[in-house]
Interface confidence: medium
């Protein structure tokens, strides 16, 4: 098979957007399977047409409606003949157009009067490509060969820059880059104390506008009264916009405020936010818990707990917790140091304990009292009582924060 590209020069140059028809003539084969190849890859589309001129003469067409830069390359056609592939002479297709930008000026944020650079690059074909720079509507540099770097000594207000690329086919304009001025950040807002304990406070806030410069850190200032002596100042890297304040005094009034800084300096402070740390839970367990059995039930008594210091605040009600080995358990809150227990089974052993609470929580549990289901002769108790006394093993004055109906898993209640 004699195979040649008909009517096409070895180099074909077209303008961008123009139609192109490559044709390939095959002679000496009755039914050629003509394939078009571009840069080594078979062209897998239907923009192709095969026309029989005569029994042994075919023309294949590859049709491009509107040539683009991506269509440029080396084309040839090929046919299979007796297991061998025959290849035509190639055509180099060049698509010319106005310059195409490969690098365009980018938006920047710079400090006032600080020097900066902008880059621009464009390519043909046709080459050469020259670059002209614009600042707003004023031409400021060029023509210079592509690529081009514009050095600017500084700006004092937001300014627009663009570049223009020229070649024999015409000119193309780049995107417009805006060079913004950096500024100090705005004050943070929504400053919130998210968690409070007796000695710690968690703080969160929303950053204000960053002044077009990355926020680097925020400072949390703590005083014991707005405008009072600074107790604490914590500098935290951001994000996240949170801070944990440690080692605060319990039951104390504080105020805090926050500011954030970028490379240019700090923002104004946000408004003061007052908060109060929680007091301490009671430190002591009620002492001398004992029981008096009566005909109508069981009376429990214990000694009053006196606050160990002002940080415990006023001590509130007592919390009484009891359980029986049949699984019955309950809890009651009483104001005084005496409680009347009902609803328990006198046939089963009863274990009782008590703690005193305040606004923070319950103090440590008292030593557990076991009330036996039968009398033990010779036990000393108040007159007319039918009370059994048992000294508990492994007595405990540990501080356990009370969780409803979960206290019975503590070791002092286990065998």
């Amino acid at each position: 098979a004699g195979l040649k590209l008909m009517g096409a020069p070895v180099k074909l140059t077209v303008s961008q957007g123009q139609p192109v028809k490559l044709n390939c003539s095959v002679e000496g084969m009755e039914e050629p399977d003509i394939q078009w190849v571009k840069d080594g890859a078979v062209v897998q589309n239907l923009d192709q047409l095969y026309i029989p001129v005569s029994e042994q003469h075919w023309i294949g067409f590859l049709s491009l409606k509107s040539a683009e830069r991506s269509d440029a390359g080396r084309y040839w056609c090929q046919v299979e003949d007796g297991g061998e592939t025959e290849i035509s002479q190639p055509v180099w297709l060049t698509v010319e157009g106005v310059p195409f930008f490969t690098v365009e000026p980018k938006d920047l944020a710079v400090p006032p009067n600080a020097p900066f650079q902008l880059s621009c690059e464009a390519v043909g074909p046709p080459e050469p490509v020259t670059i002209v720079w614009w600042r707003g509507t004023t031409k400021i540099g060029g023509p210079a060969p592509s690529p081009s770097v514009l050095n600017v000594t500084g700006v004092t207000q937001s300014t627009m820059f663009s570049c223009e690329a020229h070649n024999l086919k015409g000119l193309a304009s780049s995107r417009t880059a805006t060079v913004h001025l950096q500024a100090l950040p705005a004050a943070p807002f929504n400053v919130t104390v998210t968690k409070l304990s007796s000695s710690n406070a968690s703080v969160a806030w929303m950053p204000g506008a960053d002044g077009r410069a990355l926020l680097q850190s925020c400072t949390v200032q703590v005083t014991q009264a707005p405008g009072g002596w600074e107790v604490l100042a914590v500098v935290v890297p951001v994000p996240p916009f949170t801070c944990l304040l440690r080692d605060l005094v319990p039951a104390t009034n504080y105020s805090l405020r926050v500011r954030c800084a970028n490379a240019l300096g700090p923002s104004p402070y946000a408004d003061w936010v007052p908060f109060q740390t929680k007091g301490l839970a009671p430190a002591s367990a009620p002492q001398n818990l004992h029981a008096i059995r009566t005909d109508s039930g069981l009376i429990l008594e214990w000694e009053e707990v006196i606050p160990e210091g002002p940080l415990e605040g006023p001590l509130g009600p007592y919390k009484l917790s009891w359980v029986q080995d049949n699984g019955t358990q309950d809890e009651l809150t009483v104001e005084g140091t005496r409680a009347n227990l009902t609803g328990w089974d006198p046939q089963k052993d009863l274990i009782v304990r008590v703690c005193v609470s305040n606004a923070v929580g319950c103090g440590p549990w008292s030593q557990p009292l076991v009330v036996s289901s039968h009398d033990h002769a010779g036990q000393q108790g108040p007159p007319h009582s039918r009370t059994s006394w048992l000294v508990p093993r492994g007595s405990s004055a540990h501080h356990h924060h009370h969780h409803h109906h979960s206290a019975w898993s503590h070791p002092q209640f286990e065998k």
Partner: antibody
Framework: EVQLVQSGADVKKPGASLTISCQAS????????ISWVRQKPGKGLEWMGQ????????LYGPSFQGHVTISADRSTATAYLQWRSLEASDTAMYYC??????????????????WGPGTLVTVSS | SYELTQPPSVSVSPGQTARITCSGD??????AYWYQQKSGQAPVLVIY???KRSSGIPERFSGSSSGTMATLTISGAQVEDEADYYC???????????FGGGTKLTVL
């Protein structure tokens, strides 16, 4: 004279299989592509796919890939459109179309097409 | 999948100019073809490669393409031009053809 003769109208039940044909004459069958085009009652034209008589190479439209099979028999110059399992939505007129071009002695192709008369396929229970 | 969009209907008086549009994202790179289908008949190729008239088609039929829009123009429409017109083009990938939804031309 180029002629495309299509098989006659057919009525089938859903789930049935069917093959319709398009026999070409008046030209060298292997030189050209044949397309199948569907037209549902009162609706527009839909390109289903095409086959080149020479190498039986096929192309399908996305909506028809896997639903129909296009084939050709060079010895009888016939193109076929086949369904394994018909659905009521397959009720339509089916045209076969021969695509062609000539160079009029030059190297600029002139297009022409020949359409078959169509085969009406009705799928109804 | 790729779509070509046409107006459902266009009406003109005899002798007026009718314009039928077809829009598709690939039309800047792919040629448009136009078919005429009269009631109960098979379609006929009217225009190929955007603007080339098929043999035997009257000169009043012309085609053009700009950007993503192809247009079929009938200058001095006749009553016999009343038909459905379909645009037809390659998908953006170039490996399957697509018809537009069709435009019913009424010549009142």
């Amino acid at each position: 004279e180029v002629q495309l003769v299509q098989s006659g109208a057919d009525v089938k039940k859903p789930g049935a299989s069917l093959t319709i044909s398009c026999q070409a004459s008046g030209y060298t069958f292997t030189d050209y592509w044949i397309s199948w085009v569907r037209q549902k009652p009162g609706k527009g034209l839909e390109w289903m796919g095409q086959i080149r008589g020479q190498h039986s190479s096929t192309l399908y439209g996305p909506s028809f890939q896997g639903h129909v099979t296009i084939s050709a028999d060079r010895s009888t110059a016939t193109a076929y459109l086949q369904w394994r399992s018909l659905e009521a939505s397959d009720t339509a007129m089916y045209y076969c179309v021969r695509h062609g071009a000539s160079t009029s002695g030059g190297t600029i192709p002139e297009y022409y097409q020949h359409w078959g008369p169509g085969t009406l396929v009705t799928v109804s229970s | 999948s790729y779509e070509l969009t046409q107006p459902p209907s266009v009406s003109v008086s005899p002798g007026q100019t009718a314009r039928i549009t077809c829009s598709g994202d690939a039309l800047p790179k792919k040629y448009a073809y136009w078919y005429q289908q009269k009631s109960g008949q098979a379609p006929v190729l009217v225009i190929y490669e955007d603007a080339k008239r098929s043999s035997g088609i009257p000169e009043r039929f012309s085609g053009s393409s700009s950007g993503t829009m192809a247009t079929l123009t009938i200058s001095g429409a006749q009553v016999e031009d009343e038909a459905d017109y379909y645009c037809y083009s390659l998908s953006d990938s170039g490996n399957y053809f697509v018809f537009g939804g069709g435009t019913k031309l009424t010549v009142l």
